[in-house]
């Protein structure tokens, strides 16, 4: 069964900067990745980025840079311009659309006890939906 993993990492040097790492474990070719925060895409979440293997990447503030790390994983850098950091208690979700498996989504967040520079362990919340 395909699986999506999500890691959220606070940058050690910049406490207002976070990076979300997501990956797809499974066969098939990825046709689209959608990253959202505050919940799953289309279920109360707010879209942060869309990464298409052919068309490029489109991102929305406060996302700063979305990139493919490998052909099955992506990273999304976020920067909080406000005084307080809303990211620390936020859930980030990644949805991978792949052929022929369909769509698979998982969410993760920064653990409350995280020290800067430490990343959350892979947290595939079982929202795994085959759309």
């Amino acid at each position: 069964t395909p699986e999506v993993w999500v890691q959220v990492q606070m940058e050690a040097t910049e406490l207002s900067s976070f990076t979300v790492h997501c990956g797809f474990l499974g066969p098939g070719s990825i046709s689209l990745v959608t990253v959202s925060w505050g919940g799953p895409d289309g279920a109360g979440g707010t879209k942060l980025a869309v990464l298409h293997p052919e068309l490029g990447t489109r991102q929305w503030a406060p996302a700063r840079q979305a990139r493919w790390e490998t052909q099955s994983s992506i990273s999304l850098a976020l920067e909080d311009s406000g005084a307080s950091s809303p990211f620390a208690n936020t859930t980030f979700c990644c949805k991978f659309a792949s052929f022929p498996e369909g769509s698979w989504e998982s969410c993760g967040s920064l653990p409350p006890s995280s020290d800067p520079g430490l990343s959350a362990p892979p947290t595939p919340v079982p929202i795994l939906r085959a759309d």
């Epitope: 293997p53 052919e54 068309l55 490998t70 052909q71």
Partner: antibody
Framework: QVQLQQSGAELMKPGSSVNLSCKAT????????INWVKQRPGHGLEWIGE????????NYNEKFRGKATFTADTSSNTAYMQLSSLTSEDSAVYFC?????????????WGQGTSVTVSS | DIVMTQSPSSLAMSVGQKVTMSCKSS????????????LAWYQQKPGQSPKLLVY???TRESGVPDRFIGSGSGTDFTLTISNVQAEDLADYFC?????????FGGGTKLEIK
């Protein structure tokens, strides 16, 4: 032939707002993003943001957030950009441009541009 | 944001000569999936809007004469105009179409002697 027809030149007072239009013809308006680009002499081309007509989806360059607002009317195949609280820094030519089929941000068709002059 | 830097800012050439202009990006524009570079070139003639010449660094837009040749990969790109014509008098801009926000170079002004 795909065309983007923009509204005419505007002479505006500081502090006022202006609404620019971009009418699309000969393609399915709701299928393509419309980009807005600013050009000032000596400042090159700056991407203001984009809108996908037929949806509420917009995307703004952070530099222009609060300055520009995008809307679209699918019944007339027209995209709009409102610029608010105008200053001399907003004096420029503004282009609308269609995002292409093959890449999100390669812009394959451009309007002729609208010149906005802000002067008291 | 990805910073695009063009050089030279202007150049003057005679009809029939070969013109080369450069564009550098602050980060790689190479897509690991299709090995395409997300770099476009636009031509803007005086008083007109920009016109897409080349995308994916080397793919000519339909209708663009084959004397316009885009090349390069990663962070270094070149637009070459072989056998330059009088109607090529224009500003030329490179643009990364890799990610939001798309950013443009400062332009190269081509003058014809």
């Amino acid at each position: 032939q795909v065309q983007l027809q923009q509204s005419g030149a505007e002479l505006m007072k500081p502090g006022s707002s202006v609404n620019l239009s971009c009418k699309a013809t000969d393609y399915t308006f709701t299928d393509y993003w419309i980009n807005w680009v600013k050009q000032r002499p000596g400042h090159g081309l700056e991407w203001i943001g984009e809108i996908l007509p037929g949806s509420v989806t917009t995307n703004y360059n952070e530099k222009f957030r609060g300055k520009a607002t995008f809307t679209a009317d699918t019944s007339s195949n027209t995209a709009y950009m409102q610029l608010s609280s105008l200053t001399s820094e907003d004096s420029a030519v503004y282009f609308c441009a269609r995002g292409s089929d093959y890449s999100y941000y390669a812009m394959d068709y451009w309007g002729q541009g609208t010149s906005v002059t802000v002067s008291s | 944001d990805i910073v695009m830097t063009q050089s030279p800012s202007s150049l003057a050439m005679s009809v029939g000569q070969k013109v080369t202009m450069s564009c550098k990006s602050s980060q790689s524009l190479l897509n690991i999936f299709n090995q395409k570079n997300f770099l476009a070139w636009y031509q803007q003639k005086p008083g007109q809007s920009p016109k897409l010449l080349v995308y994916f660094a080397s793919t000519r837009e339909s209708g663009v004469p084959d004397r316009f040749i885009g090349s390069g990969s990663g962070t270094d790109f070149t637009l070459t105009i072989s056998n330059v014509q009088a109607e090529d008098l224009a500003d030329y801009f490179c643009q990364q179409h890799y990610s939001t926000p798309p950013t443009f170079g400062g332009g190269t002004k081509l003058e014809i002697k």
